[in-house]
């Protein structure tokens, strides 16, 4: 009786079942009556990351220097090329196809998680205490100068934006 | 049915190199692997290597330097071609069909010699 | 490479005997999938080798069943329970297990 289905690491063709080929290795032919399939294992540059029945290996990821990728960690035959961005940059998108400036926070805004190669800038409003007066990818919200340390007086309130300007205290009660 | 006809230029002076064609029928080389096998007078068979449906090929390692097999589909012909050929290389030279192992062609007879 | 080794080189019997040819392998001839891929050729004289017997012990269409395969591993053998005339020529053991693939030496069966 032929079988309608195989075991875990095989495949049904032709009424029989074929042991599918380790990860790194393609088919080369299936198996017969007189044979066990046949695998080769998968050239320079190639992969194949499960057990399979392809007929050809795939190819690496190529890390292209003029989209602002580079190797992050080098293929072999089991596992693809994984791309990172240079510095400066980071991936558009979870496959790291392309590479895009790190955005920057605006004034009135910090760094709240400074970018990497696979992630932007992730900025987060100043609160109330803070500021931050630069357009910066990696300055945080900085807080209000303290006058009362520097015995000086509050001249003009601080904003999101801008840091209180001290002054000295008023002499006359 | 599946037949297999190796045809060759029967003798090859010394260090000369051998070309042997094998004929199919009755089964599709680009869905099927072909092995050569050779015997030696009065010997023992030595497989010498496969070419598989996609074209790849192995080898056997200890005269993969002097070997090359390959073929055309569209002719249904698969080529050996050896190089550097010796007294020792003197033999029947046998196509065989993958998974049809039970077809042998009637092999072609190769003499080296002077 | 796996090195295939016959016992006895050669064999003489009468016709009606019995006769037992031994093939050993340098190393197991048991694939991960579980099956050994071990044949047996029956090389007439001036003929190219005819199948007889593969996975171990599955005789191949058209094979007269006096014709027995057995063993595991690393040891098996081809048995002929009553030996015919058609039967004499030489006889190989084949492992395509393992790339490369080998044979035996063979085993000349002859009339006593």
């Known amino acids: 009786e032929p079988p309608t289905a195989c075991r875990e690491k095989q495949y049904l063709i032709n009424s029989q079942c074929c042991s599918l080929c380790q990860p790194g290795q393609k088919l080369v032919s299936d198996c017969t009556e007189f044979t066990e399939t046949e695998c080769l294992p998968c050239g320079e540059s190639e992969f194949l990351d499960t057990w399979n029945r392809e007929t050809r290996c795939h190819q690496h990821k190529y890390c292209d220097p003029n989209l602002g990728l580079r190797v992050q960690q080098k293929g072999t035959s089991e596992t693809d090329t994984i791309c990172t961005c240079e510095e400066g940059l980071h991936c558009t998108s979870e496959s790291c196809e392309s590479c895009v400036p790190h955005r920057s926070c605006l004034p009135g805004f910090g760094v709240k998680q400074i970018a990497t190669g696979v992630s932007d800038t992730i900025c987060e409003p100043c609160p109330v205490g803070f500021f931050s007066n630069v357009s910066s990818a990696f300055e945080k919200c900085r807080p209000w100068t303290s006058c009362e340390t520097k015995d000086l007086v509050v001249q003009q309130a601080g904003t999101n934006k801008t840091d209180v300007v001290c002054g000295p205290q008023d002499r006359q009660r | 049915q599946v037949q297999l006809k190796e045809s060759g230029p029967g003798l090859v002076a010394p260090s000369q190199s051998l070309s042997i064609t094998c004929t199919v029928s009755?089964?599709?080389?680009?869905?099927?692997?072909v092995h050569w096998v050779r015997q030696p007078p009065g010997k023992g068979l030595e497989w010498l290597g496969v070419i598989w449906a996609g074209g790849d090929t192995n080898y056997n390692s200890a005269l993969m330097s002097r070997l090359s097999i390959s073929k055309d589909n569209s002719k249904s012909q698969v080529f050996l071609k050896m190089n550097s050929l010796q007294k020792d290389d003197t033999a029947i030279y046998y196509c065989?069909?993958?998974?049809?192992?039970?077809?042998w062609g009637a092999g072609t007879t190769v003499t080296v010699s002077s | 490479d796996v090195v295939m080794t016959q016992t006895p080189l050669s064999l003489p019997v009468s016709l009606g005997d019995q006769a037992s040819i031994s093939c050993r392998s340098s190393?197991?001839?048991?694939?991960?999938?579980?099956?050994?891929?071990l044949q047996w050729y029956l090389q007439k004289p001036g003929q190219s080798p005819g199948l007889l017997i593969y996975?171990?012990?599955n005789r191949f269409s058209g094979v007269p069943d006096r014709f027995s395969g057995s063993g595991s591993g690393t040891d098996f053998t081809l048995k002929i329970s009553r030996v015919e005339a058609e039967d004499l020529g030489v006889y190989f053991c084949?492992?395509?297990?393992?790339?490369?693939?080998?044979f035996g030496g063979g085993t000349k069966l002859e009339i006593k």
């Open positions: 065989l069909g993958h998974g049809h192992f039970d077809v």
């Open positions: 009755g089964f599709s080389l680009p869905t099927s692997g």
């Open positions: 190393q197991s001839l048991v694939h991960s999938s579980g099956n050994t891929y």
């Open positions: 084949s492992q395509t297990t393992h790339v490369p693939w080998t």
């Open positions: 996975k171990v012990s």
